[in-house]
Interface confidence: low
């Protein structure tokens, strides 16, 4: 069950808990995740991370009894850890992941915890002894059992089946706003000298939060949001309220890179590096953060803020929330990413901007390419417009910018001219008394996939040329051959005469050169990300997924890709998992990265895989994984024995019993079989594919993966009473592919 | 021994309301969660409707056929649950049965009352 | 909403017999299934919780089995007193559902 920083389950317990047998299995990166509280009036038990440690507290009347874990094993590493607390014949013993952490007497008195059991989070409860514990779980929790009972059943709406993705998700995926009701919260924004913030965006949002920090003194906050398809940010400091806009659109579903750059003097913000700044006035000072850092929506306390706030900030939107995503988020100059986040609601890992609706512009065909880009760019309030001065000559009467510019058209990997109509003026140069060699270009911004080369002496390095440059050809612009259709020069134009004419002319305005890329078609190819040999273990599978080979294609998705396997189709060792038996002599990269093929060795020198891959239109050039079969080696890596009370039942776990193999890269299956009668007791293993509460059978054979997850157990049976401890001898043998090892 | 009473059923006009309560002794009432359960010829058994203890802040939970109808609440001074019903339909007509949880071992219902028959008709 | 749906409406058995009685979810439930038996004219009482495990007091003849989404009651011996309506529920989430029942008559 996914727990994401803000959720709990609750499960009554009507009565006196007198035995405890407690059993989780959590996985968090978080430091501080409180895992589960049975509440009393005075009564409590509370298991939570701490710094990294896990914790335990018990309360029993007047007594208080603390465990924790050493601080050198921190469990916050994203790993599932298994703990198991047992209260038995006044006795307290914590174990995690099958080692021994702590035990201590504790009295002999039921636990009365009449509140119930709270897993994961305390919800509202308000109890003096909840002050100071761990925030709610932001993690998992894999099983958690009371005396056997699942504690996890039934799921409230919000605590999700299955581990979630975003727990896992390094800060390199992009955080999904898949709304309505999305948000993710970090650790506060500080901007004590400066903060900034910085993303790349992309979203058809017009209206839509995009980050929220309080400060300290009420009333006080940064707000950045998206205000009519563009960004806006507010600033509200006790003395004042700084507003600021950018022009750039940033509702067109394209990734848009934004920045928020705030200290003591002035605050900014830039999209696609064209910024927006206050003047240096000075108003802003300090704003001490409270609470944290709110991306991609806002919380109930937020929205009332927004609310409250003389500006009506959030006329109808202050439940809205971004619906797309936030790539590369860095905070401070920090990367962040889901893994960082205190706590989310509705996210996804990854980039998932209404895939459905979109898909068929994405690759559909090229042509279609030639008209998004310049219905783009209007919108773009560049050059700021220019209020000429009385008194100037009539050719200025009407004038607001010197350019008309138009998108310049290249192909990828191409070139183009710059050309007149590219940067028509807007008035008659004659009668303004002005030559084209006056009107001079600086390149203040180059493109991202291009470069602007001019063939003028020394031009080069100063970036400059001037309108006669233009009409003699001698500025073009080569593009790089990457992939994105759109991008931009900025320019700033500035004339050098000494005639009577608007001051702006002679300061410079800024204009954006639109670049509109028209795409050319790439072969796919296919790459080894770990060189073109794989070997396997002889008589078994191994799955065949991106790890081993991959296509690159620079211009289609992987829903457009197909590869087939060359050769002939008889003995192919390659099978679609839900059809064993059966060749697959194509298959589609959906189905290579879901991880739906598998490479079955039935015996004999392994049989190399020559593969192709096509786009639909062109196909790769073929490409051979050299496929080796190693007999299988098994070595044992634990065989601890276990230590338990007559009449009890002790899990076996990893740290007991493991065996190593000679697999490179492949997840074989281990088997355990039982080949003598055993005297004290049986081995068990839990039904039903480890459902939490499933019951447990006696068993005769297990697999390392049983081991793995908690499901294979001990049980002590024997009901005589011994004046020494008695010892079972459990012999087993290990079976990999046909490989047995025996006398383990 | 457990028993549990259930009252305030009867005859309503569609658009109507009604208060059922429901009086329970033999356990301790406050640490339960409790719930009340309908049973139709036409929709079978239905949970309806649960409320949880004084510490959970008496946190609410309905089935969305009833949700902005249907209002539980407790009372654990008097050991008693109460389901206040407004803007009645012909489709709320069955017998009602308060029940409450088993002890932590799942949400499956241990104690019923005997049920009182509420008929919503013109 | 889960839908929890029992295949037959009513069976008839005789004294003795072995009888099952089926349930299947719409999706997966774990083991977070309860059985209940209601007698004419009287309330449903709980026989089985987390699929297989007896509630107290309930005979052993009545046992069940099953996780995921197929779950089995079975009587292994019914007894006359045993004429009654079964019903199955989940409480893997909410909201909590039940089956639509099945009737056990004696020939």
């Known amino acids: 069950a996914s727990f994401f920083g803000e959720n709990h389950l609750e499960v009554p317990v009507a009565t006196a808990l007198t035995d405890i047998d407690l059993q989780l299995q959590f996985s968090t990166s978080q430091p501080e995740a409180l895992l589960l509280l049975a509440a009393g009036p005075a009564d409590h038990l509370l298991l939570q991370l701490y710094s990294g440690r896990l914790q335990v507290r018990l309360v029993l009347g007047q007594e208080e009894l603390r465990l924790q874990t050493p601080a050198e094993t921190l469990l916050s590493d994203s790993i599932p850890h298994t703990v198991v607390l047992t209260v038995v014949e006044g006795w307290a013993t914590l174990s995690v992941d099958g080692f021994l952490n702590a035990s201590s007497a504790v009295p002999g008195a039921p636990l009365e915890v009449p509140y119930g059991l709270f897993v994961g989070g305390t919800g509202t409860l308000g109890l003096p002894y909840l002050r100071g514990t761990s925030r709610p779980l932001r993690g998992c929790l894999h099983a958690a059992t009371l005396n056997g009972r699942s504690l996890l059943r039934p799921l409230t709406p919000d605590v999700h089946e299955g581990c979630a993705e975003e727990f896992s998700a390094s800060d390199d995926v992009a955080l999904g706003f898949s709304g309505p009701h999305s948000l993710a919260a970090f650790p506060a924004w500080g901007t004590q000298d400066e903060g900034t913030l910085e993303f790349t965006l992309t979203t058809q949002s017009r209206q839509a939060p995009l980050a929220f920090q309080a400060g300290g003194r009420r009333g006080d906050f940064i707000y950045v949001d998206i205000f009519e398809g563009h960004l806006r940010a507010v600033v509200e400091k006790g003395q004042g309220t700084v507003l600021l806009h950018n022009s750039v659109p940033v509702a067109d579903g394209q990734p848009h890179e934004v920045s928020v750059h705030i200290n003591a003097h002035r605050l900014e913000i830039s999209v696609d590096q064209y910024p927006t700044h206050t003047s240096n006035r000075g108003v802003l000072s300090y704003l001490e953060p409270r609470g944290s850092l709110l991306l991609g929506g806002l919380d109930a306390e937020a929205s009332r803020h927004l609310q409250e706030h003389r500006l009506g900030l959030t006329p109808e939107a202050t439940n809205a929330s971004l619906l797309g995503c936030m790539e590369d988020l860095s905070v401070n100059g920090q990367r962040r990413g889901l893994r960082e986040a205190l706590l989310t609601r509705n996210m996804a890992a990854g980039c998932r901007l209404e895939e459905e609706e979109y898909e068929d512009d994405a690759y559909g065909h090229y042509e279609a390419f030639s008209t998004l880009a310049p219905e783009a760019w209007p919108a773009m309030e560049l050059p700021e417009p220019c209020v000429p001065e009385p008194g100037l000559p009539p050719v200025f009467a009407n004038f607001t910018q010197l350019l008309t510019i138009s998108p310049l058209v290249v192909a990828e990997g191409g070139t183009a001219w710059l050309e007149w109509r590219h940067v028509q003026p807007t008035l008659d140069l004659m009668e303004a008394e002005l030559r084209k060699s006056q009107v001079l270009f600086s390149v203040t911004r180059g493109a991202r996939h291009g470069e602007l080369e001019l063939d003028i002496p020394g031009a080069q390095a100063r970036k400059m040329f001037t309108l006669l440059d233009v009409v003699n050809r001698k500025a073009r612009f080569i593009h790089d051959g990457s992939e994105d259709t759109s991008d931009q020069l900025v320019l700033e134009v500035s004339v050098t005469a000494r005639v009577p004419m608007p001051s702006c002319l002679r300061r410079g305005q800024t204009y954006l050169l639109p670049i509109q890329v028209n795409p050319v078609n790439d072969p796919p190819h296919i790459i080894f990300p770990h060189g073109s040999l794989m070997v396997i273990l002889e008589h078994t599978q191994k799955p065949l997924g991106p790890e081993v080979f991959q296509a690159y294609d620079p211009d289609s998705a992987c829903e457009g890709l197909t590869f087939q396997v060359l050769g002939t189709s008889s003995g192919l060792p390659v099978e679609r998992r839900d059809q064993p038996g059966e060749p697959a002599t194509e298959f589609s990269c959906r189905e290579l990265e879901a991880g739906s093929l598998v490479y079955v060795h039935r015996g004999g020198p392994a049989q190399d895989l020559t593969f192709r891959v096509s786009d639909g239109l062109q196909a790769s050039p073929p490409a051979t994984l050299k496929v080796v079969a190693i007999r299988p080696a098994i070595q044992i890596h634990r065989s601890t024995g276990l230590r338990l009370a007559q009449g009890s039942a002790m899990p076996i776990l990893p740290a007991n019993l493991s065996v190593e193999t000679n697999a490179v890269g492949q997840d074989v299956s281990v088997l355990f079989r039982v080949t003598g009668a055993l005297q004290f007791g049986e081995l068990q293993k839990q039904g039903a594919g480890g459902v939490e509460g499933a019951e447990w059978w006696a068993t005769q054979a297990f697999h390392q993966r049983d081991v793995e997850q908690g499901r294979v157990r001990y049980l002590s049976t024997d009901p005589q009473h011994h004046a020494y401890d008695t010892v079972e001898n459990l012999a087993l043998e290990v079976q990999v592919g046909q490989e047995i090892l025996s006398n383990l | 021994e457990v028993q549990v009473e259930v009252s305030g059923g009867g005859l309503v006009q569609p658009g109507g309301s009604m208060r059922l309560s429901c009086a329970v002794s033999?356990?301790?009432?406050?640490?339960?969660?409790m719930n009340w359960v309908r049973q139709s010829p036409e929709k079978g058994l239905e949970w309806i409707a649960e409320?949880?203890?004084?510490?959970?802040?008496?946190?609410?939970y309905y089935a969305e056929s009833v949700k902005g109808r249907f209002t539980i609440s407790r009372d654990n001074s008097k050991n008693s649950l109460y389901l206040q019903m407004i803007s009645l339909r012909a489709e709320d007509t069955a017998i009602y049965y308060c029940t409450s949880y088993g002890n932590y071992v799942g949400h499956y219902f241990d104690h019923w009352g005997q049920g009182t028959l509420l008929t919503v008709s013109s | 909403d889960i839908v929890m749906t029992q295949s037959q409406d009513s069976m008839a058995t005789s004294v003795g017999e072995r009888v099952t009685v089926n349930c299947k979810a719409s999706q997966n439930v774990d083991t977070n299934v309860a059985w209940y038996q209601q007698k004419p004219g009287q309330s449903p009482e709980p026989l089985l919780f987390?699929?297989?495990y007896r509630y107290t007091g309930v005979p052993d003849r009545f046992s069940g089995s099953g996780s995921g989404t197929d779950f089995t009651l079975t009587i292994s011996s019914v007894q006359a007193e045993d004429v009654a309506e079964y019903f199955c529920?989940?409480?893997?989430?909410?909201?909590?559902?039940f089956g639509q029942g099945t009737k056990l008559e004696i020939k």
């Open positions: 529920q989940q409480y893997n989430s909410y909201p909590l559902t």
């Open positions: 033999g356990f301790t009432f406050s640490n339960y969660w």
């Open positions: 409320i949880r203890l004084k510490s959970n802040n008496f946190a609410r």
């Open positions: 987390s699929a297989s």
